[in-house]
């Protein structure tokens, strides 16, 4: 058993049929010695008396808010949550496996630039009695500070018969150094509590590996005189790190016909303009990636040819 | 470069960008690792990193690029030695057209651009001993190539910025 926060305790249980469970001793936080009784949750049933209460925690029915009373007045509370371990593996019932980029990916994180700011998100099908808290640091043995904001419900989607909820959090490294080569990874730890179930999820990454630029902005087409060719231009997204002479992007451009089956030629360039043949009904698209490190490509930015 | 002269920024830019391409072709990003790559924090602490105080940011380069160039050169020589060591020459053997061979040559080429013959800067000692099992060797190769990718990305940014803003 360990303390998650004041008056909230997590009991770690090996979860299998007829498991013996954990013996837990609760102590009433009071100078009083006599006339103390204990109850669980809203039930008025007295579980025991005295300054301490010894219980055997085996299942969710044994978890909950234990209260010690004297003379009808509550003296202190202890909330017991359960953390299940099945076959040596901690349970992951609350969050959905996003399976990208690999199996057992429960937290996904992205950064738009090298400023040390990043966003993490996760999915669940649970809609009520659910709370999250997030901690983050750079490195774990000698951690450096990362500050995370409040967790927000960022999206709701219907997937077949189920509703899926996306939660996200924004974090900022306290002393980011955008130009340096990261030596220690960022660690993100999410505590999830659903009713009386406690779970924790972690992710470890370098900012450089989670970079995903915003799409290029300000796409423009300029037809060339007496030619089927068009000069296309675009700009770095506003959110990308500066100066651009240092934090450079590379671009992938393509012209897509009306039919998705039509062959599309992709051209790679470090420039912010190109000359292409842009037929009527087609569209021109461009995406960006860090020029020197193969992190994610941005989403496509598109503009119709006509 | 030693003693404060400027490097051939444009040449360094070209070669460092080539290094980035080679480093990624030698170890592309894949969704899952077939051998567990992630070790504890200490695994790549013995390779040189370009750190915050090394003057490799745009402001530091403007003030005095020498600190940063020395750091980059130390790293290049360190990785060049690693790529020539039995970590890479042992089983499983590199084939004649291995990108590691090209990487090795390019690391040497860029380090020489930064230090013409006759000047010698301090370089870090290469760690030893190297692993005896092929699977340990593979793991170490992947770690080295991953950290090399991060190192040459910073070096390439430095040379791109230098070529754009510091060239005479």
């Amino acid at each position: 058993i360990w303390e998650l926060k004041k008056d909230v305790y997590v009991v770690e249980l090996d979860w299998y049929p007829d498991a013996p469970g954990e013996m837990v001793v609760l102590t009433c936080d009071t100078p009083e010695e006599d006339g103390i009784t204990w109850t669980l949750d809203q039930s008025g049933e007295v579980l025991g008396s005295g300054k301490t209460l010894t219980i055997q925690v085996k299942e969710f029915g044994d978890a909950g808010q234990y209260t010690c009373h004297k003379g009808g007045e509550a003296l202190s509370h202890s909330l017991l949550l359960l953390h299940k371990k099945e076959d040596g593996i901690w349970s992951t019932d609350v969050l959905k496996d996003q399976k990208e980029p690999k199996n057992k990916t429960f937290l996904r994180c992205e950064a738009k630039n090298y400023s040390g700011r990043f966003t993490c998100w996760w999915l669940t099908t649970i809609s009520t009695d659910l709370t999250f808290s997030v901690k983050s640091s750079r490195g774990s043995s000698n951690p450096q500070g990362v500050t995370c904001g409040a967790v927000t419900l960022s999206a709701e989607r219907v997937r077949g018969d189920n509703k899926e909820y996306e939660y996200s959090v924004e974090c900022q490294e306290d002393s980011a150094c955008p130009a340096a080569e990261e030596r220690l990874p960022i660690e993100v730890m999410v505590d999830a509590i659903h009713k009386l179930k406690y779970e924790n999820y972690t992710s470890s990454f370098f900012i450089r590996d989670i970079i995903k630029p915003d799409p290029p902005k300000n796409l423009q087409l300029k037809p060339l005189k007496n030619s089927r060719q068009v000069e296309v231009s675009w700009e770095y997204p506003d959110t990308w790190s500066t100066p651009h002479s240092y934090f450079s992007l590379t671009f992938c451009i393509q012209v897509q016909g009306k039919s998705k089956r039509e062959k599309k030629d992709r051209i790679f360039t470090d420039k912010t303009s190109a000359t292409v043949i842009c037929r009527k009904n087609a569209s021109f698209s461009v995406q960006a990636q860090d020029r020197y490190y193969s992190s994610s490509w941005s989403e496509w930015a598109s503009v119709p040819c006509s | 470069v030693p003693g404060g002269s400027s490097p051939a920024w444009a040449q360094c830019q070209q070669l460092s960008q080539k290094l980035c391409t080679l480093a990624w072709s030698a170890h592309p990003l894949v969704g899952h690792m077939d051998l567990r790559e992630e070790g504890d924090e200490e695994t790549t602490n013995d390779v040189p990193h370009i750190q915050c105080g090394d003057g490799c940011d745009p402001q530091g380069l403007r003030d005095n690029s020498q600190f940063c160039l020395q750091r980059i050169r130390q790293g290049l020589i360190f990785y060049e030695k690693l790529l020539g060591s039995d970590i890479f020459t042992g089983e499983p053997s590199l084939l004649p057209d291995s990108p590691v061979g090209q990487l090795h040559a390019s690391l040497l080429g860029l380090s020489q651009l930064l230090q013409p013959e006759g000047h010698h800067w301090e370089t870090q000692q290469i760690p030893s001993p190297s692993p005896s099992q092929p699977w340990q060797r593979l793991l170490l190769r992947f770690k080295i190539l991953r950290s090399l990718q991060a190192f040459v990305a910073v070096a390439a940014r430095v040379f791109a910025h230098g070529a754009a803003t510091l060239s005479p």
């Epitope: - | 077939d34 567990r36 499983p92 053997s93 084939l95 057209d97 291995s98 590691v100 593979l138």
Partner: nanobody, 121 residues
């Protein structure tokens, strides 16, 4: 040039067993993934079993529980143990290896020439 050479094919009765071998010209640590595929004339080549470096084998549903893929690092060889063979297992069996990217700039995918398995009573 890296080569894979299969052997061990031949005639087998339904319910019988056969052991296919695939010998590599380089250490099998050189391969990120090795696999056995099979092809029947007029049909696409289908995956039978694969094994990643340091991993355990994965099998196609049709052969699970009957076929076993293994490797011998010292002999630079991978094997396909075929038990409880069925008529539908008759095909040309190919060995495949995908080389680690750092070992070569070209031809990451290496194929053997194939070995024929005939199932007949």
């Amino acid at each position: 040039e890296v080569q894979l050479v299969e052997s061990g094919g031949g005639l087998v009765q339904p319910g019988g067993s056969l052991r296919l071998s695939c010998a590599a010209s380089v250490s099998i640590w050189s391969f990120k993934v090795m696999g056995w595929y099979r092809q029947v004339p007029g049909k696409q080549r289908e995956l039978v079993a694969t094994i990643t470096t340091g991993g355990s084998p994965d099998y196609a549903d049709s052969v699970k529980g009957r076929f076993t893929m293994s490797r011998d690092y010292d002999k630079r060889t991978v094997f396909l143990e075929m038990d409880s063979v069925k008529p539908e297992d008759a095909a040309v069996y190919y060995c495949n290896g995908r080389l680690w990217a750092h070992l070569t700039s070209s031809g990451h995918d290496v194929w053997g020439q194939g070995t024929r398995v005939t199932v007949s009573s």
